[in-house]
Interface confidence: low
C-alpha cells in the first residue's frame, strides 16, 4: 500500500489516522527533500489532486482540511514542486480510514444445529462500523466458573466437545475497534434447550380424487429428537398472506399432511420445526410448489419445478434443490 513508500518527509493526520466518520480532519505534509525548498506542496487523495482547502503553514509544511469526511478509506500522499525539477517529488503517503465505534452487540443467540457438533452463536452487531472490528465471544460455565474466549470477525462456531463445563453457560460478546469497545448483555443458556432439529424437508405432494379433492404433502426430517413441534405455511403464489398449520410430530415415519385447496391454483409450501417447548426454530425449508388440478384427477408435485403441470393424471414433483426463502422466522 501507500504506507510502504520511501518517504522524503512526513505526512500525518489529526485527530488520528482512523477517525469517526463525519469528522473534520486535517492532513499535514512536511517536506524533507535534499536541495529542495518546495515552491508548492500538493495533496492527492486516491490519486486525484486536491485543489481546495490547502494552507501553507511554513516553508516546508502544508495542511489539507476536510470538512465532514465520509469516505471509509482513502489513500493520501503529498508531493513537492522543487526548483530545477521537471516533476513533482513524492514526500510521503498514508492510508486513512473513517468509521464508527461498535454498537453494543445485542440479540446474542446461541443454537446447536442437530448433528453439527457445534454451538453457533450470532448477534446483531448494530450499524456498520466501516473499519476492522473484532468480536470476542466469552463462554463461562455456570458450574465450573471456567471461562473460554473466542476471537472472530462475525459469528462463531464452538465445538460442543470443547464445552466441558456442564450444561449451563453464560455467553456474552465484546466488540472492539480503533474507535471504541462495547459489551453485550449476558445470555444464559442450557445446552439441552438450544438444539434445533435436523432440517425438515417437503419431498412431494399429491392431490387425490375425492368428493372434495384433497392435497397431501409428504415431509420428513432426520431428527432423533422425540418431541418436535412443526409449522407448515402455505399460500397461493398470488397471495401475500401465509396460512399456518401446526403439528406435533414424531419423525419415525414420513409425515403426511392434508390440505383442502382451491382447484387450478399454484401454491407454495414451507415447513419448519423446533424441539417442543424450546425457543428456537429451524429456518423455513426451501419453497415447494404444487399446482392443484382443474377438476379431480390425481396430481403429484415436485419442489420448485416452475410450472410443472400436465393436464393428465400426474404432475411429478420431487424435492431437489434449495431456494433461498424468507427466513424471517429463522431462530427466534
Amino acid at each position: 500500500g501507500i504506507t510502504n513508500i520511501n518517504c522524503s518527509g512526513h505526512i500525518w493526520v489529526e485527530p488520528a489516522t482512523i477517525f469517526k466518520m463525519g469528522m473534520n480532519i486535517s492532513i499535514y505534509c512536511q517536506a524533507a527533500i535534499k536541495n529542495c525548498q518546495p515552491r508548492k506542496l500538493h495533496f492527492y487523495k486516491n490519486g486525484i489532486k486536491e485543489r481546495f482547502q490547502i494552507t501553507r503553514i511554513n516553508k516546508t509544511t502544508a495542511r489539507l482540511w476536510y470538512k465532514n469526511f465520509l469516505e471509509p478509506h482513502a489513500s493520501m500522499y503529498c508531493t513537492a514542486e522543487c526548483p530545477k525539477h521537471f516533476q513533482e517529488t513524492l514526500i510521503c503517503g498514508k492510508d486513512i480510514s473513517s468509521g464508527y465505534p461498535p454498537d453494543i452487540p445485542d440479540e446474542v443467540t446461541c443454537v446447536i444445529y442437530e448433528y453439527s457438533g457445534n454451538m453457533t452463536c450470532t448477534w446483531n452487531a448494530g450499524k456498520l462500523t466501516y473499519i476492522d472490528t473484532k468480536y470476542v465471544v466469552h463462554v463461562k460455565s455456570l458450574e465450573t466458573e471456567e471461562e473460554q474466549q473466542y476471537l472472530t470477525s462475525s459469528y462463531i462456531n464452538i465445538s460442543t466437545d470443547s464445552l466441558q463445563g456442564g450444561k449451563k453457560y453464560l455467553v456474552w460478546v465484546q466488540a472492539a475497534n480503533a474507535l471504541g469497545m462495547e459489551e453485550s448483555k449476558q445470555l444464559q443458556i442450557h445446552l439441552d434447550d438450544i438444539v434445533i432439529p435436523s432440517a425438515a424437508v417437503i419431498s412431494r405432494a399429491e392431490t387425490i380424487n375425492a368428493t372434495v379433492p384433497k392435497t397431501i404433502i409428504y415431509w420428513d426430517s432426520q431428527t432423533t429428537i422425540e418431541k418436535v413441534s412443526c409449522e407448515m405455511r402455505y399460500k397461493a403464489t398470488t397471495n401475500q398472506t401465509w396460512n399456518v398449520k401446526e403439528f406435533d410430530t414424531n419423525f419415525t415415519y414420513v409425515q403426511q399432511s392434508e390440505f383442502y385447496l382451491e382447484p387450478n391454483i399454484k401454491y407454495v409450501f414451507q415447513v419448519r420445526c423446533q424441539e417442543t417447548g424450546k425457543r428456537y426454530w429451524q429456518p423455513w425449508s426451501s419453497l415447494f410448489f404444487h399446482k392443484t388440478p382443474e377438476t379431480v384427477p390425481q396430481v403429484t408435485s415436485k419442489a420448485f419445478q416452475h410450472d410443472t403441470w400436465n393436464s393428465g393424471l400426474t404432475v411429478a414433483s420431487i424435492s431437489t434443490g434449495h431456494l433461498t426463502s424468507d427466513n424471517r422466522g429463522d431462530i427466534g
Epitope: D106, E107, N124, G126, R233, T241, W242, N243, V244, E246, W281, D326, R328, G329, D330, I331, G332
Partner: antibody, heavy 121, light 107 residues
Framework: DVQLQESGPGLVAPSQSLSITCTVS????????VHWVRQSPGKGLEWLGV???????DYNAAFISRLSFSKDNSKRQVFFKMNSLQPDDTAIYYC???????????????WGQGTTVTVSS | DIQMTQSPASQSASLGESVTITCLAS??????LAWYQQKPGKSPQLLIY???SLADGVPSRFSGSGSGTKFSFKISSLQAEDFVSYYC?????????FGGGTKLEIK
C-alpha cells in the same frame, strides 16, 4: 433498554395527510418487525399494519389505499404516512414491536407512548 | 375479518377477589391470542401470548386459557394496580383484531 417513541404533528386538517416517525432504541429494525395500532374512544384498538424486518409491509385492508410505511434501519426510524384524514381518524397512534420472529404470530411486547392526533379544521 | 367479542365490558370486584374475562373469536384461531393491560394515559402492555404463556416480568396471578374460539383471562387475588383495562387480540390472520376491552373497577 428497548424503547419506541412516536413523534407526530398533533393537529391535522381534514383531507390532509398524517406523518409520524417512530424512533426505536435497544433493538435493531433489521431483526424486528414494527406494527402500527391506533386507539380511539369510538373504535377501540385498531391494527393498521406492520413493516417486517426485511422492509416488506402488510396493511389492514380497510386502510390500504391511504397508508404507507417505510423505515431507515441505520437511523432506527420507522415512518408512517396516512392520507386523506377525516375527523373519525382522530386517535392515539402507537408503534409497537413484535417480540420475536414468528411470522404473523407475534404479540407486541413493547409499545411507544403514543402520539395523539386530532383531525379538525 | 375475525371479530373478537370480549365480555364483560366492565366489571366491579373487590381487592383480593378473582375475576375472569372472556374473549370469543368469530372463527377458530388456534392458540394465537394475546392479552394486554392498559393503564389510564399509558400504552398497552403485554401480559399473555399464545393464549396461555406469561410474558416476561408479569406476575403469576395473571393467567390465560382456551383455544379455538373461546378464551379466558383470569386475575386471582386482585391488587389495587389491577383495576385498569384489559384487551384480547387475535394473532391468527390479517388484519389483527382486538376485543372491545374490559374495564375493571373497585367495588
Amino acid at each position: 433498554d428497548v424503547q419506541l417513541q412516536e413523534s407526530g404533528p398533533g393537529l391535522v386538517a381534514p383531507s390532509q395527510s398524517l406523518s409520524i416517525t417512530c424512533t426505536v432504541s435497544g433493538f435493531s429494525l433489521t431483526n424486528y418487525d414494527v406494527h402500527w395500532v391506533r386507539q380511539s374512544p369510538g373504535k377501540g384498538l385498531e391494527w393498521l399494519g406492520v413493516i417486517w424486518s426485511d422492509g416488506s409491509t402488510d396493511y389492514n385492508a380497510a386502510f390500504i389505499s391511504r397508508l404507507s410505511f417505510s423505515k431507515d434501519n441505520s437511523k432506527r426510524q420507522v415512518f408512517f404516512k396516512m392520507n386523506s384524514l377525516q375527523p373519525d381518524d382522530t386517535a392515539i397512534y402507537y408503534c409497537a414491536r413484535n417480540n420475536y420472529y414468528r411470522y404473523g404470530r407475534n404479540p407486541m411486547d413493547y409499545w411507544g407512548q403514543g402520539t395523539t392526533v386530532t383531525v379538525s379544521s | 375479518d375475525i371479530q373478537m367479542t370480549q365480555s364483560p365490558a366492565s366489571q366491579s370486584a373487590s381487592l383480593g377477589e378473582s375475576v375472569t374475562i372472556t374473549c370469543l373469536a368469530s372463527q377458530t384461531i388456534g392458540s394465537w391470542l394475546a392479552w394486554y393491560q392498559q393503564k389510564p394515559g399509558k400504552s398497552p402492555q403485554l401480559l399473555i401470548y399464545a393464549a396461555t404463556s406469561l410474558a416476561d416480568g408479569v406476575p403469576s396471578r395473571f393467567s390465560g386459557s382456551g383455544s379455538g374460539t373461546k378464551f379466558s383471562f383470569k386475575i386471582s387475588s386482585l391488587q389495587a394496580e389491577d383495576f385498569v383495562s384489559y384487551y384480547c387480540q387475535q394473532l391468527y390472520s390479517s388484519p389483527l383484531t382486538f376485543g372491545g376491552g374490559t374495564k375493571l373497577e373497585i367495588k
